[in-house]
């Protein structure tokens, strides 16, 4: 259950960015679609977007749209949404016209005279805003994701391109490129641009190389960059770590598996608030970290970083953050103490030396000092204690 | 039921103007975004032109555009296109047409048809 953003760090995503310079393509974006390659049509009116009118919709202004896209052609016709039925005349004569309110409501439509973009023009007011949308699914569904990372948020870069997934090279990788990948997926922003072999390497095609991000770019594909052909190998696949990205640690115990409960989330190290910390989320943790399962949770300490985060699981949940959580932004944890625990693979328990981390666990570093891009395009520097 | 008249057709040597008017019965004509389309013999129907409710938005056609422009006054119920640099390609039966849900680009979305005039462009 992903927490909204607080006010200074705004969850952004496609739908905040423009495609295009003014008059250099289509002013038109795709929303609430299974990728950026399909959805609800928006044309860009000034300073908003508006829903693109069904009934002018067409298969010339669809195949406009995916190729504007970079989406490859439009799927076939009776994939679209099909014709919108002509509309009650409205009241006898006689009655109070609605030609201004219809013309303030009127939705606007993309018209166009033949399959390419240039051929086209937004049109406002050219429809009755009767609910009716341009939707449409184009042939190359071009999608983004981070993998082995222990989230959605964190781990090797993957593209979807001609029907498979595949990575991107690490070469000239920063975190501009990160972030246009973070702020894509919906994950913040980028805490972390990583090099090869901080992830499991990836298998399919290398489908970019050399990309290089203004940090401004709606889609990774908006990036400059090569094809991902010759001069790469898994090794270099480059991966990223995301400001909604959660891993945790235990610390101020007698190792790894003991001690006070933190989060890194959001580019800082916060405590967990005790007062809903139960055994199942406990356990959760403790199995999380390769740690066993949870044996004890001692009193917790007054919160000695920023407490703000909340878990509730069932005991099932492979990590804490497939739990139900939420992160409270404005408040610390009100009236209780840090979460702390204490796992059966503790040495304090078992007087062992420390335990290796299981390899079916994967971990990301944070390393003690990342530049953290914010979305105004400054850099701070945090010291991560 | 909307009535849809055109005028204003007729026989016009290439390079020419002609202005074709289409009075409508509706008293709601303000109502309705209005259009023209042609047929040229042996041709099948093709959009010329549309406007919205109150005119403040226009579409043309490729072919017409830069030589045609479409307008309405909605206190005389009218609808004007002004034919400028008339082509032979130009000839044909150009119609009126009325649309209450969208601008009449489409034939689909099309309410109400006029009868249609004649224009021909012809040395």
């Known amino acids: 259950h992903p927490s909204p953003a607080p006010p200074d760090q705004l969850n952004t995503s496609s739908a905040e960015s423009e495609l295009w310079e003014p008059g250099e393509r289509l002013p038109v974006r795709l929303t609430n679609g299974s990728s950026s390659c399909s959805g609800t049509v928006e044309v860009r009116l000034e300073a908003s977007w508006e829903p693109a009118c069904g009934a002018l919709w067409d298969s010339r202004a669809a195949e406009a749209v995916c190729r504007a896209l970079g989406c490859g052609g439009a799927e076939a016709a009776s994939q679209l949404a099909p014709p919108t039925p002509e509309l009650p005349p409205p009241p006898a004569a006689g009655n109070t016209s609605v030609a201004a309110n219809a013309t303030l409501a009127g939705a606007p439509a993309l018209l166009c005279s033949g399959a390419e973009w240039r051929l086209c023009e937004v049109v406002e007011h050219a429809c009755r805003s009767d609910g009716r949308r341009a939707r449409v699914t184009c042939a190359e569904n071009r999608a983004l994701r981070l993998v082995d990372g222990g989230g959605a948020c964190a781990g090797r870069v993957e593209m979807l391109e001609h029907g498979e997934w595949g990575s991107v090279c690490d070469d000239t990788w920063d975190l501009e490129d990160a972030h246009v990948v973070c702020r894509q997926l919906g994950c913040g922003w980028a805490v972390q641009a990583l090099p090869g072999l901080h992830f499991t390497p990836g298998r399919g095609p290398i489908h970019r190389d050399q990309v290089n991000c203004s940090g401004a770019e709606a889609y990774l594909w908006d990036c400059p960059g090569l094809p991902g052909q010759h001069y790469c190998g898994h090794k270099e696949d480059a991966g990223a770590v995301c400001s909604e990205h959660q891993s945790w640690r235990l610390t101020g115990g007698a190792d790894r598996c003991e001690g006070q409960v933190e989060v890194h989330f959001r580019g800082v190290w916060n405590t967990v608030c005790d007062s809903e910390w139960y055994p199942s989320e406990a356990k959760v943790l403790c199995q999380s970290l390769g740690c066993g399962t949870a044996v004890e949770r001692p009193k917790g300490l007054p919160h000695s970083l920023s407490g703000r985060m909340y878990y509730s699981c069932n005991g099932e949940e492979l990590t804490l953050s497939n739990c139900s959580w939420r992160f409270n932004n404005s408040n610390l944890c009100s009236q209780s103490l840090a979460a702390r625990v204490l796992c059966s693979a503790s040495r304090s328990l078992h007087n062992l030396s420390t335990p290796e981390v299981p390899a079916s666990v994967q971990t990301v570093t944070i390393e003690s000092s990342v530049t953290v891009k914010i979305e105004n395009k400054e850099s701070r520097e945090l010291m991560l204690l | 039921q909307v009535q849809l008249v055109e005028s204003g057709g007729g026989l016009v040597q290439p390079g020419g103007s002609l202005r074709l008017s289409c009075s409508a019965s509706?008293?709601?004509?303000?109502?309705?975004?209005m259009g023209w389309f042609r047929q040229a013999p042996g041709k099948e129907r093709e959009f010329v032109s549309a406007i919205n409710w109150v005119g403040g938005s226009t579409y043309y056609a490729d072919s017409v555009k830069g030589r045609f422009t479409i307008s309405r006054d909605n206190s005389k119920n009218t609808l004007y296109l002004q034919m400028n640099s008339l082509r032979a390609e130009d000839t044909a039966v150009y119609y009126c047409?009325?649309?209450?849900?969208?601008?009449?680009?489409?034939?689909?979305?099309?309410?109400?048809w006029g009868q249609g005039t004649l224009v021909t462009v012809s040395s």
């Open positions: 047409v009325a649309s209450w849900g969208a601008m009449p680009v489409l034939t689909h979305v099309i309410n109400y």
């Open positions: 509706e008293r709601t004509f303000s109502d309705y975004a």
